[in-house]
């Protein structure tokens, strides 16, 4: 069964800066990745970035530097201050559309005990939806 993992890390140098990494553990080819915060897209979340292997990448503030790390994992940085910047308990979700598995989504947030600069290991997060 495919799985999605989500890792959230607060940068030690910039307390309002977060790095989000997501990956897809499956054999299919990925056609689209959507990253959101505040919950899944369509369930109160806000799109932060959309990554397509051929059509490119779009990102919306406060997201910066959204990129493919491998063929099956992505990362992006969130930075900023004020109302549109993340806080420690913000939920981040990644949805991977792949063929032939379909769409798989998982969410994660900063571990409560983590210090700046530390993060939870990138273990699979609970799968919220498989379309």
């Amino acid at each position: 069964t495919p799985e999605v993992w989500v890792q959230v890390r607060m940068e030690a140098t910039e307390l309002s800066s977060f790095t989000i990494r997501c990956g897809f553990l499956g054999s299919g080819s990925i056609s689209l990745v959507t990253v959101s915060w505040g919950g899944p897209n369509g369930a109160g979340g806000t799109t932060l970035a959309v990554l397509h292997p051929e059509r490119g990448i779009r990102q919306w503030a406060p997201a910066r530097q959204a990129r493919w790390e491998t063929q099956s994992s992505i990362s992006l940085i969130l930075e900023g201050s004020g109302a549109s910047s993340p806080c420690a308990n913000t939920t981040f979700c990644c949805k991977f559309a792949s063929f032939p598995e379909g769409s798989w989504e998982a969410c994660g947030s900063l571990p409560p005990s983590s210090d700046p600069g530390l993060s939870a290991p990138p273990t699979p997060a609970p799968i919220l939806r498989a379309d």
Partner: antibody, heavy 119, light 106 residues
Framework: QVHLQQSGPELVKPGASLKISCKAS????????LNWVKQRPGQGLEWIGW????????FYNEKFKGKATLTVDKSSSTAYMLLNSLTSEDSAVYFC????????????WGQGTTLTVSS | DIQLTQSPSSLSASLGGKVTITCKAS??????IAWCQHKPGKGPRLLIH???TLHPGIPSRFSGSGSGRDYSFSISNLEPEDSATYYC????????FGGGTKLEIK
């Protein structure tokens, strides 16, 4: 067919507030950012801010913070922009425009709403 | 904020000819530039995004190129309906428009 239909022209007095509407059709309203753009007479285009209708999350150009407030009514697929404490500097044409994501920014535009602020 | 300097601010060209408009960003915008056409009394129309990708339905006589901070937009085989104001727009971070170029076809 994507369509953004804006409310009609307005003549208001200085100091008043005004809410402009933008009714979206032909796509899933909650899935795309909706932006507002200002054009003063004889001048260029200025981005005011955006709203993501699915979550009602907003982001404003610093210049328009406190001047514009963006909201949506998901049940009617309508976006609104409230402009307050109006002055002659706010006299302009205001456009709503959809961000198409990977299809490009501002892929569909409303026809514009002309606002005249005059006593 | 990212600034865009668009030039020229106006130009006149002959029917069937070619024009080029340039846009310079205050920093690298990673090819996230779009070009719009605006005619009086109408909403603007997206022509090109991501430097050179034509929006559906836009004829191939419109083209764009560039990278880093420097970008250009061209129209060849000019037609009467190309008379309009053209804007560049960066969307690498937030959104900023260039000052516009008013094109007149002779």
């Amino acid at each position: 067919q994507v369509h953004l239909q804006q409310s009609g022209p307005e003549l208001v007095k200085p100091g008043a507030s005004l809410k402009i509407s933008c009714k979206a059709s032909g796509y899933t309203f909650t899935d795309y950012y909706l932006n507002w753009v200002k054009q003063r007479p004889g001048q260029g285009l200025e981005w005011i801010g955006w709203i993501f209708p699915g979550s009602e999350s907003t982001f404003y150009n610093e210049k328009f913070k406190g001047k514009a407030t963006l909201t949506v009514d998901k049940s009617s697929s309508t976006a609104y922009m409230l402009l307050n404490s109006l002055t002659s500097e706010d006299s302009a044409v205001y456009f709503c425009t959809r961000d198409g994501g990977l299809r490009g920014p501002f892929d569909y535009w409303g026809q514009g709403t002309t606002l005249t602020v005059s006593s | 904020d990212i600034q865009l300097t668009q030039s020229p601010s106006s130009l006149s060209a002959s029917l069937g000819g070619k024009v080029t408009i340039t846009c310079k960003a205050s920093q690298d915008i990673n090819k996230y530039i779009a070009w719009c056409q605006h005619k009086p009394g109408k909403g603007p129309r997206l022509l090109i995004h991501y430097t050179s990708t034509l929006h559906p339905g836009i004829p191939s006589r419109f083209s764009g190129s560039g990278s880093g901070r420097d970008y250009s937009f061209s129209i060849s085989n000019l037609e009467p309906e190309d008379s309009a104001t053209y804007y560049c727009l960066q969307y690498d971070y937030l959104l900023t428009f260039g000052g516009g170029t008013k094109l007149e076809i002779k």
